[in-house]
Interface confidence: low
């Protein structure tokens, strides 16, 4: 069957039969990703994604990280990874532990970005960055 790039209901079929993401969202492995062009703090970024029926992206596989890095245009984006100082560990916003490496760590950098480098970078939660939202594809 033919795959249409655009449909009248504001959804786009992307890279998978019968699986759709909203317009301007990217499809990858049954998930939809939105890369914002505006910026805000981490808390406001979390609310921004929530307003779109999504969460900040949980980039918990190397394949997902590579996919997102390929489309981030040398920009920095907040993701759903925060440092729990009392535990001395990074956790995704679904509460799962991140055991990988986060560069640029600093006692004031409790949030994380991807996009400008090939790694997860610690960042100030109060500085404005773009954000990546994630939700299930329909």
């Amino acid at each position: 069957p033919q795959i249409f790039n655009k449909s009248n209901d504001g959804f786009t079929t992307t890279r998978s039969y019968g699986t759709v993401c909203p317009k301007d969202w990217e499809f990858y492995q049954a998930r939809c990703f939105f890369l914002s062009t505006s910026e805000s703090s981490w808390n406001e970024s979390r609310d921004f994604c929530k307003g779109k029926g999504s969460t900040l992206a949980i980039v918990n596989t190397p394949e997902k990280l590579k996919f997102l890095q390929d489309i981030t245009d040398a920009e920095k984006y907040f993701i759903g990874l925060i440092y729990h100082r009392e535990e001395k560990r990074w956790r995704w916003i679904n509460n799962s532990v991140f055991n990988g490496n986060v560069t640029n760590q600093n006692q004031n950098f409790n949030c994380a970005t991807i996009g400008l480098t090939k790694t997860f970078d610690a960042a100030s939660c109060d500085i404005s960055y773009r954000r990546i939202c994630e939700k299930n594809a329909k």
Epitope: D24, F34, S36, T37, S38, E39, S40, S41, E44, F48, D73, A74, E75, K76, G115, L116, D126, I127, S128, Y129, R130
Partner: antibody
Framework: QSLEESGGDLVKPGASLTLTCTAS?????????MCWVRQAPGKCLEWIGC???????TYYASWAKGRFTISKTSSTSVTLQMTRLTAADTATYFC????????????????WGPGTLVTVSS | AIVMTQTPSSKSVPVGDTVTINCQAS????????LAWFQQKPGQPPKLLIY???TLASGVPSRFKGSGSGTHFTLTISDVVPDDAATYYC????????????FGCGTEVVVK
């Protein structure tokens, strides 16, 4: 490439007014911001707010929140809706483009319209 | 909200001299030293001269130089020519969660 503002007028206090900024020779880039800045006669430049073209996110100076609204109406135009106008809103209103705020692209309004005059007087 | 304070408010300078304009931010500007300088002549919109503190905008002569970091920034115009007579504004950016951008109130440069 150019920008042009329109819609400036003489209005009475309490009135509403919508200004339009139209791009010629280019369409708004998804990564750019379209912003409004005003300047009262003989006074400083005053930032009003910006709209991120790609995702529609807007942000405003604290004094403008609730009274001023920036919207994208097409790939080449944005509007500034102003309500409950007072004499203090009398100014020339400029629209300006900021190519990108993110990454290392930095900040700087690289393209401005000539401005449109709004006069609020009874 | 960030507040940008410019000094002096006016400066008279002979042709060929150097003029320095200062801009102080009430708080540190956002990462990458997001501070810009604009030139405005009567009846015209502002023109971008410098962005990210020291990067010259396209077509701007190298006589214009921006420097500084954090809260203190400077615009230096060397070998001043009559066409440099204008009002110069700095603008700082801190991000959407802190009321966005703010302009200084300008420094008028008079060329003698």
């Amino acid at each position: 490439q150019s920008l042009e503002e329109s819609g400036g007028d003489l209005v009475k206090p309490g009135a509403s007014l919508t200004l339009t900024c139209t791009a010629s020779g280019f369409s708004f880039s998804r990564s750019s911001y379209m912003c409004w800045v005003r300047q009262a006669p003989g006074k400083c430049l005053e930032w009003i707010g910006c709209l991120s073209v790609g995702d529609g996110h807007t942000y405003y100076a604290s004094w403008a929140k609730g009274r001023f609204t920036i919207s994208k109406t097409s790939s080449t135009s944005v509007t500034l809706q102003m309500t409950r106008l007072t004499a203090a809103d009398t100014a020339t209103y400029f629209c300006a483009r900021a190519p990108s705020y993110s990454g290392d692209g930095g900040h700087g309004y690289d393209l401005w319209g000539p401005g449109t005059l709004v006069t609020v007087s009874s | 909200a960030i507040v940008m304070t410019q000094t002096p408010s006016s400066k008279s300078v002979p042709v060929g001299d150097t003029v320095t304009i200062n801009c102080q931010a009430s708080e540190s500007v956002d990462r990458n030293n997001r501070l810009a300088w604009f030139q405005q002549k009567p009846g015209q919109p502002p023109k971008l001269l410098i962005y990210t503190t020291s990067t010259l905008a396209s077509g701007v002569p190298s006589r214009f130089k921006g420097s500084g970091s954090g809260t203190h920034f400077t615009l230096t115009i060397s070998d001043v020519v009559p066409d440099d007579a204008a009002t110069y504004y700095c603008a700082g950016y801190r991000g959407a969660h802190t009321d966005g951008d703010a302009f200084g109130c300008g420094t008028e440069v008079v060329v003698k």
